[in-house]
Amino acid sequence: LPKAPVITTPLETVDALVEEVATFMCAVESYPQPEISWTRNKILIKLFDTRYSIRENGQLLTILSVEDSDDGIYCCTANNGVGGAVESCGALQVKMKPKITRPPINVKIIEGLKAVLPCTTMGNPKPSVSWIKGDSPLRENSRTAVLESGSLRIHNVQKEDAGQYRCVAKNSLGTAYSKVVKLEVEVFARILRAPESHNVTFGSFVTLHCTATGIPVPTITWIENGNAVSSGSIQESVKDRVIDSRLQLFITKPGLYTCIATNKHGEKFSTAKAAATVSIAEWSKPQKDNKGYCAQYRGEVCNAVLAKDALVFLNTSYADPEEAQELLVHTAWNELKVVSPLCRPAAEALLCNHVFQECSPGVVPTPIPICREYCLAVKELFCAKEWLAMEEKTHRGLYRSEMHLLSVPECSKLPSMHWDPTACARLPHLDYNKENPKTFPPMTSSKPSVDIPNLPSSSSSSFSVSPTYSMT
């Protein structure tokens, strides 16, 4: 007798790993024999799809090699024309052992920055990710966290964070380990012991010490008055990432000696500097109330203006007087590019001699101000038009910067050459040519490239750094 189909083994949920076999069974009793069709997520599975095996008149559906995308609801429908069609459904849950899809890579990072070691995983159930440093599980702390993605984030990287890391992805089906990667922490060059200034007698020997550290270990170079040290012997030793350099000098003139520690981070370099002065006792005896010291000018901007080997006053109210004063002239120098050919050399001479004042070595190194007459010559003769324009702008408050730019000297406050010819400095460039009183000897101007540090406001009585002047 005809019998409507009955599914005697309803479909069950099937768990399968990727690449495994998964079989659904839909045993049907009926007469005549039913036609059985299969769907996945309500889409008909075609009999000729070679990824599937349909056996026993459609009662067994096998996925021969499960893929991620096979996850879903599978239904069998049996129909033999007697009564209605019957259906049974079951889920295929594709399980997956943990797999690390984006493993960590070796990282070089500078101390203090944030490091992220990637570890992206796949798996079902979703794997939990932990990290191993060296041979021990890594404990999370205020700086270290395992992100939702599995990546390891380390804030404010410290030297002790360096080491070997690997991530571990784990679920109920298994565990996957990444390869071991290295976190290298690099540290900017830093001076541990700066050279000390010395006041010695002419012809003495002096040893300057400079100790620096960093990762990688920095190299130390010595600079004497702006140039590489030409004489003297250097001895170096390295121990436990600390480099110690000793420069031995035979002193015949005063000088500024700078120790520069440099190390490389990829394509970039980090440097640390420390300077010491070596003065000769007869030239200047440092006192408590010193405002600065005498040293040879070794900048670039005023090379053409100042006399060769000029002894200039370096104002110690700046952390790095040479660099600070050089920056002052450099910044103002750029503004002089647009002034008239008559004004420019005079203004440059005034600028350089005002910032790098001639220095009188003695018991207390003293700056020698520019003679009032020379200042007035620039103001009223060479640069009258520009000076007026600049004063107008100053009154309108157009110059606000307290840093980096030089104020115009107040000519009236400068000493006159008629009072004491030795109390003020002359500007040789402004001495009149008898044939043409408004000509100057030819001058070269150059724009050196200067690194711009953060400058402190000057507390010097010799010159101030407010408000700006421009001769345009």
């Epitope: 099937v14 399968a16 076999v21 079989t23 069974m25 045993a27 056996r55 026993e56 008149n57 067994l60």
Partner: antibody, heavy 121, light 107 residues
Framework: EVQLVESGGGLVKPGGSLRLSCAAS????????MDWVRQAPGKGLEWVSS????????YYADSVRGRFTISRDNAKNSLYLQMNSLRAEDTAVYYC??????????????WGQGTLVTVSS | DIQMTQSPSSLSASVGDRVTITCRAS??????VNWYQQKPGKAPKLLIY???TLQSGVPSRFSGSGSGTDFTLTISSLQPEDFATYYC?????????FGQGTKLEIK
């Protein structure tokens, strides 16, 4: 009574061919999946091949795929195994078995007595 | 392919003993596991199908259990006629596979 009788075994040289037959009786042959299973001397059972009740699907073990061919003639109640490119490791007793669908997959509820195939030079 | 691993490969026991043979599948095979008995020179004989269903005509001292990957065949009280080789088989995949066999010998 269900009966399965194999024939066609014998001695054959490596590279040679042989055709095994299995005559079925006592049941509706056309309603069952049929399989071949072999057993090398002193070894365990090894499934060889399977064919659906109306020949709609065929499966082979990796070790014989491309060399053996399973077929059936429902009109004659017969199952066949054509064996080509025979190798020494094909030496075994070959059984035909009936596949029965149950609540969880199929099982071999009836077996023939087997036929010995010897591949040797 | 799905591998079926039987243990032990051989076993000595006495009449009346309780014996357990295990079979492990290389992946989950639901309950699609069958057990066969084979005596020397004879064809295999079906004992248990669908992991735990006793085939008609097989003594009740034979029982099967398991699901997923781990299966067992138990003989509750060994009889002299039970000394033979036992095989598990999976039919979850259309590419069926057998375990390597467990030879049960008289102690």
């Amino acid at each position: 009574e269900v009966q399965l009788v194999e024939s066609g075994g014998g001695l054959v040289k490596p590279g040679g061919s042989l055709r095994l037959s299995c005559a079925a009786s006592g049941f509706t042959f056309s309603s069952y999946t049929m399989d071949w299973v072999r057993q090398a001397p002193g070894k365990g059972l090894e499934w060889v091949s399977s064919i659906g009740s109306n020949g709609d699907y065929i499966y082979y073990a990796d070790s014989v795929r491309g060399r053996f061919t399973i077929s059936r003639d429902n009109a004659k109640n017969s199952l066949y195994l054509q064996m080509n490119s025979l190798r020494a490791e094909d030496t075994a007793v070959y059984y035909c078995a009936r596949g029965q669908l149950a609540v969880a997959g199929t099982h071999f509820d009836y077996w023939g007595q087997g036929t010995l195939v010897t591949v040797s030079s | 392919d799905i591998q079926m691993t039987q243990s032990p490969s051989s076993l000595s026991a006495s009449v009346g003993d309780r014996v357990t043979i295990t079979c492990r599948a290389s992946q989950k095979v639901n309950k699609y596991v069958n057990w066969y008995q084979q005596k020397p020179g004879k064809a295999p004989k079906l004992l248990i199908y669908a992991a735990s269903t006793l085939q008609s005509g097989v003594p009740s001292r034979f029982s099967g259990s398991g699901s997923g990957t781990d299966f067992t065949l138990t003989i509750s009280s060994l009889q002299p006629e039970d000394f033979a080789t036992y095989y598990c088989q999976q039919s979850y995949s259309p590419l069926s596979t057998f375990g390597q066999g467990t030879k049960l010998e008289i102690k």
